[in-house]
């Protein structure tokens, strides 16, 4: 949940209280367990050559 | 203030090694996925190397050009990055940019260090 | 390995005038939600700078004169209006996948 008292994130984007600030849904590819991920609607999978180079 | 500071560029032989090592502050320099880039004029940015998280077992991925030859490592410790490069040649001649990223861009960068590889 | 062409090589805009650079990649970097395609800005003798992250999204503190667009394989990044400062060379980059690669630039000048 975003901390009180602060603007909401833009669309596309979701609130990191581990960050401090609001963080791009679409990076939840690369870093699915990061805390703003639950935030944000569906984190697409990674390609494969991406998890598995 | 965040600062990417690299060190250990210099004059090396062809066929030599060399030790690029970089320091970080201001950021959470172990939360970062950290890179290598080059740039030179003949082929502009590249990409080299890269080293994700402790949680990620500090995986690490190359580019085709310097796999076997190049080594990624950091120490998260000392927030510092490194680059160790063997059986260098005239074509890694550049300047090496140490790149810290929350993800799969490069939101911070160093001044960079110039390798120069002759004889 | 993803080819990012960029385009123009070189071009020289107005003060104030609107600057727009193509950015094209060999095959697909989008998901039906996000593009996996970033800008850079390079002034001369310094390092690059993040300006825009998943095509359309400003990095912390880069002035709103710079936007991102496109999907797929076509990307723009459009600068306007410009003012002196930006006369630099510009760079794209995909993350679709490993390894990562750039474009190879385009230099702005300001008359």
């Known amino acids: 949940e975003q901390a009180p008292g602060t603007a909401p994130c833009s669309r596309g984007s979701s609130w990191s209280a581990d960050l401090d600030k609001c963080m791009d849904c679409a990076s939840c590819r690369a870093r699915p367990h990061s805390d703003f991920c639950q935030g944000c609607a569906a984190a697409p999978p990674a390609p494969f050559r991406l998890l598995w180079p | 203030e965040v600062k990417l500071e690299e060190s250990g560029g210099g004059l090396v032989q062809p066929g030599g090694s060399m030790k690029l090592s970089c320091v970080a502050s201001?950021?959470?320099?172990?939360?970062?996925?950290m890179s290598w880039v080059r740039q030179s004029p003949e082929k502009g940015l590249e990409w080299l190397a890269e080293?994700?998280?402790?949680?990620?077992?500090?995986?690490?991925h190359y580019a085709e050009s310097v796999k076997g030859k190049f080594t990624i490592s950091r120490d998260d410790s000392k927030s510092r990055l490194y680059l160790q490069m063997n059986n260098l040649r005239a074509e890694n001649t550049g300047i090496y940019y140490c790149?810290?990223?929350?993800?799969?861009?490069?939101?911070?960068w160093g001044q960079g260090t110039t390798l120069t590889v002759s004889s | 390995d993803i080819v990012l062409t960029q385009s123009p090589a070189s071009l020289t805009v107005s003060l104030g005038q609107r600057a727009t650079i193509s950015c094209r990649a060999s095959?697909?970097?989008?998901?039906?939600?996000?593009?996996?395609m970033q800008w850079y800005q390079q002034r001369p003798g310094q390092p690059p700078k993040l300006l825009i992250k998943?095509?359309?999204n400003l990095d912390s503190g880069v002035p709103a004169r710079f936007s991102g667009s496109g999907s797929g394989t076509d990307f723009t990044l459009n600068i306007h209006p410009v003012e002196e400062e930006d006369a630099a060379t510009y760079y794209c980059?995909?993350?679709?996948?490993?390894?990562?690669?750039f474009g190879g630039g385009t230099k702005l000048e300001i008359k």
């Open positions: 790149t810290g990223g929350f993800a799969d861009y490069f939101d911070y």
């Open positions: 201001g950021f959470t320099f172990n939360n970062y996925w």
């Open positions: 080293i994700r998280l402790k949680s990620d077992n500090y995986a690490t």
């Open positions: 095959q697909s970097v989008s998901t039906s939600s996000y593009s996996y």
């Open positions: 998943y095509a359309t």
């Open positions: 980059q995909h993350s679709w996948e490993i390894p990562y690669t």
